[in-house]
């Protein structure tokens, strides 16, 4: 008879466990990389590469692994305790206000501005006015108005693990 420790204890609800006073911080909870069985008897391991859980929990199901979109590269794979980490491809970035997609970095700054920051997976190139040093955050300028520069090298994730 299996005690089902392969995907484990509490009321059947898909939710993070409430922080109530316990004799042990993990009392009645399953460890990262597991979820609770439907009958509340045991902890069951998440399936490697398919789903995960990052905290002590009483989830009925592990969380589904993120699949990197086209236009993204996989920095680290999904494990039973950590979601996939995806990053925008070189020359593209993900903005905080539009995290659902990677956007192309501008190829250069408008006239009268100089580049002070490279294209990274989480930010566009940064341009400032030559004289005042104030930042420019406008639309991508017309091609003939730009001072070209090559995109920077991606360095760290823009899609954080769950």
């Amino acid at each position: 008879e299996s005690a089902l420790i392969t995907q484990q204890d509490l009321a059947p609800q898909q939710r993070a466990a409430p922080q109530q006073k316990r004799s042990s911080p993990s009392e009645g909870l399953c460890p990262p990389g597991h979820h609770i069985s439907e009958d509340g008897r045991d902890c069951i391991s998440c399936k490697y590469g398919q789903d995960y859980s990052t905290h002590w929990n009483d989830l009925l199901f592990c969380l589904r692994c993120t699949r990197c979109d086209s236009g993204e590269v996989e920095l680290s794979p999904c494990t039973t305790t950590r979601n996939t980490v995806c990053q925008c491809e070189e020359g593209t970035f993900r903005e905080e206000d539009s995290p659902e997609m990677c956007r192309k970095c501008r190829t250069g700054c408008p006239r009268g501005m100089v580049k002070v920051g490279d294209c990274t997976p989480w930010s566009d190139i940064e341009c400032v006015h030559k004289e005042s040093g104030t930042k420019h955050s406008g639309e991508v300028p017309a091609v003939e108005e730009t001072v070209t520069s090559s995109p920077g090298t991606p360095a760290s994730p823009c899609s954080l693990s769950g």
Epitope: E1, S2, A3, I5, D9, R41, D42
Partner: antibody
Framework: QVTLKESGPGILQPSQTLSLTCSFS??????????VSWIRQPSGKGLEWLAH???????RYNPSLKSRLTISKDTSRNQVFLKITSVDTADTATYYC??????????WGQGTLVTVS | DIVMTQSHKFMSTSVGDRVSITCKAS??????VAWYQQKPGQSPKLLIY???TRHTGVPDRFTGSGSGTDFTLTISNVQSEDLADYFC?????????FGGGTKLEIK
């Protein structure tokens, strides 16, 4: 505070039935996921798991002793019981009850020594 | 049944030393392993569960590691009060099984 305490006959003769009681406090056996096991340890030897009862009265037994074991509970009185039939000198041991909830045996009783002689 | 093997029945160490007690499962048990300490004349006490999680009140000199079939309990800066028997246990599947125990002796 979680406490468990075992009680038994102390001494009994071969072929008799051993009856053990585990009285506990600090938790309820009606709580989802909660369970109590019986574990024994012959003097100077290792630990042997015998049986487990869950909050919903589901029971598990060690297959090597299953035909001789019966575990039961009285939730309202906070007690769990174990019966072992046809005892032999090999059943001489300290018997422990321990609480389990989704993992290990986090709380143990002090144990009760049973001698079959 | 899953057999839990503690290859060393006895281990000798000195106060202040670091000692590692090993346990091997006969089949994959994931991280569903606990370690217990039993001092002479006392009942077992939970030290480590889910292979590496320290139980409430257990000193941080006790560390658990491993997954699958190989598990280790490490005691760093051994103290005289650590003289005891140490048992591993799997709760991956019924019947739950314990290792034969390792008696830690202090020189």
């Amino acid at each position: 505070q979680v406490t468990l305490k075992e009680s038994g006959p102390g001494i009994l003769q071969p072929s008799q039935t051993l009856s053990l009681t585990c009285s506990f406090s600090g938790f309820s056996l009606s709580t989802s996921g909660m369970g109590v096991s019986w574990i024994r340890q012959p003097s100077g030897k290792g630990l042997e798991w015998l049986a487990h009862i869950y909050w919903d009265d589901d029971k598990r037994y060690n297959p090597s002793l299953k035909s001789r074991l019966t575990i039961s509970k009285d939730t309202s009185r906070n007690q769990v019981f174990l019966k072992i039939t046809s005892v032999d000198t090999a059943d001489t041991a300290t018997y422990y009850c321990a609480r389990r909830r989704l993992g290990p045996f986090a709380y143990w009783g002090q144990g009760t020594l049973v001698t079959v002689s | 049944d899953i057999v839990m093997t503690q290859s060393h029945k006895f281990m000798s160490t000195s106060v202040g030393d670091r000692v590692s007690i090993t346990c091997k499962a006969s089949q994959d048990v994931g991280t569903a392993v606990a370690w217990y300490q039993q001092k002479p004349g006392q009942s077992p006490k939970l030290l480590i569960y889910w292979a590496s999680t320290r139980h409430t009140g257990v000193p941080d000199r006790f560390t658990g590691s491993g997954s699958g079939t190989d598990f280790t309990l490490t005691i760093s800066n051994v103290q005289s009060e650590d003289l005891a028997d140490y048992f591993c246990q799997q709760y991956s599947s019924y019947p739950y099984t314990f290792g034969g125990g390792t008696k830690l002796e202090i020189k």
